[in-house]
């Protein structure tokens, strides 16, 4: 049994880091493998993660962590029984994938303005809480070409757009994702999408 693709890990910078790897053949990850992880920290204890299958030869492990600070560094040992298959380390602050925003809502009753709001996925005491920026994706269910991205570079989790920038009388969907420049993170997953029917009063034309 050998590791074909070494573990790569990403952290949500809160409580979970996710490590994925591939073996050289079909593997029952949960029965054959264990990923041991330990904070490089005087008198810390090692913890064991039981991996799950992620495709035939792929494995994934969700490492539970006590918060995350920038100095954190973990040692990782991948074991198959008594055999050490791989040894490495992981610094969560250097591999951050933020949690996805939630509770995306479209408010359509504000004088021909669409107000999109969502929730910051972090509690106020987490470092990322004040460092997230967002991308909002809006698309038409009827017209695949009608697909747009709005970059929200301020901290407030909301976006206002004129309803008239979208076509009237058709349904749209929106979703939002987050990233943090301070840690050069990857983008989060997209939030679940929300749907609304776009309608607005055409401006009265004067001749």
């Amino acid at each position: 049994m050998k590791v074909l693709q070494e573990p790569t890990c990403v952290s949500d910078y809160m409580s979970i880091s996710t490590c994925e790897w591939k073996m050289n053949g079909p593997t029952n990850c949960s029965t054959e493998l264990r990923l041991l992880y330990q904070l490089v920290f005087l008198l810390s204890e090692a913890h064991t993660c039981i991996p799950e299958n992620n495709g035939g030869a792929g494995c994934v492990c969700h490492l539970l962590m006590d918060d995350v600070v920038s100095a954190d560094n973990y040692t990782l040992d991948l074991w198959a029984g008594q055999q050490l298959l791989w040894k490495g380390s992981f610094k969560p602050s250097e591999h951050v994938k933020p949690r996805a925003p939630g509770n995306l809502t479209v408010h359509t009753n504000v004088s021909d303005t669409l107000l999109l709001t969502w929730s910051n996925p972090y509690p106020p005491d987490n470092y990322l809480y004040n460092h997230l920026t967002y991308a909002v994706n809006i698309w038409s269910e009827n017209d695949p070409a009608d697909f747009r991205i709005y970059n929200v570079t301020y901290l407030e989790p909301s976006l206002r757009i004129a309803a008239s920038t979208l076509k009237s009388g058709i349904s749209y969907r929106a979703r939002v994702r987050a990233w943090a420049q301070c840690y050069n993170t990857t983008w989060s997953e997209w939030s679940p999408s929300t749907k609304w029917h776009n309608s607005y009063r055409e401006p009265f034309e004067q001749h």
């Epitope: 920290f41 005087l42 204890e45 918060d67 600070v69 100095a71 954190d72 560094n73």
Partner: antibody
């Protein structure tokens, strides 16, 4: 209420021994690494020794290595420090301290301290 | 072994003023953690800041920590009468624990 209560301090002659105890209440000792920190009269804080939550690993400052032994009895929620070959410079208030991993070494609960005096 | 040096040794200020306490490490700190403690006469120390900048439970927001590498700072934005005490920085690393020698904050 989370509390640590040290006992076992006293007056001892140079070369003698003492065993300090620390009783924990209000939390489960087995979830935490535990440490001893001391403070000589009118001086600053000095780290002495620590033990991992399971008791499987220990650490000692160079000044006490080979003379002091830290141990724990998790079912009894008690921490110990066995001190031998005591010297005058070991005279101090000894604090039992809890370290929360989430606090990254921050010692969030301290006992009131027990005084050890080494003198002839 | 890393040595922590605190400065100044004594700081004399008045209530309402801003206090800035320094802690310098003899070598750079990457995978290690800095904490700050307050100690009043006859009492055990109290944890103020951990992980360089995070306030411990129940600590007022006038206390803040910052820094990286070798230089770390504890700032008390507006001194209250109860803040006059001795302050210690502490390094908790992979292989050792070290305290600074302390800074005494006294009323001017």
């Amino acid at each position: 209420e989370v509390q640590l209560l040290e006992s076992g301090g006293g007056l001892v002659q140079p070369g003698g021994s003492l065993r300090l105890s620390c009783a924990a209440s209000g939390f489960t000792l087995s979830s935490y690494a535990m440490h001893w920190v001391r403070q000589a009269p009118g001086k600053g804080l000095e780290y002495v020794s620590g033990i991992s939550s399971s008791g499987s690993s220990t650490y000692y400052a160079n000044s006490v290595k080979g003379r002091f032994t830290i141990s724990r009895d998790n079912p009894k929620n008690t921490l110990f420090l066995q001190m031998s070959s005591l010297r005058a410079e070991d005279t101090a208030v000894y604090y039992c301290v809890r370290v929360k991993v989430a606090y990254r070494g921050g010692m969030d609960v301290w006992g009131q301290g027990t005084t050890v005096t080494v003198s002839s | 072994e890393i040595v922590l040096t605190q400065s100044p040794g004594t700081l004399s200020l008045s209530p309402g003023e801003r206090a800035t306490l320094s802690c310098r490490a003899s070598q750079g700190i990457s995978s290690a953690y800095l904490a700050w403690y307050q100690q009043k006469p006859g009492q055990a120390p109290r944890l103020l800041i951990y992980g360089t900048s995070r306030r411990a439970t129940g600590i007022p927001d006038r206390f803040s920590g910052s820094g990286s590498g070798t230089d770390f700072t504890l700032t008390i934005s507006r001194l209250e009468p109860e803040d006059f005490a001795v302050y210690y920085c502490q390094l908790y690393g992979a292989t050792s624990v070290t305290f600074g020698q302390g800074t005494k904050l006294e009323i001017k």
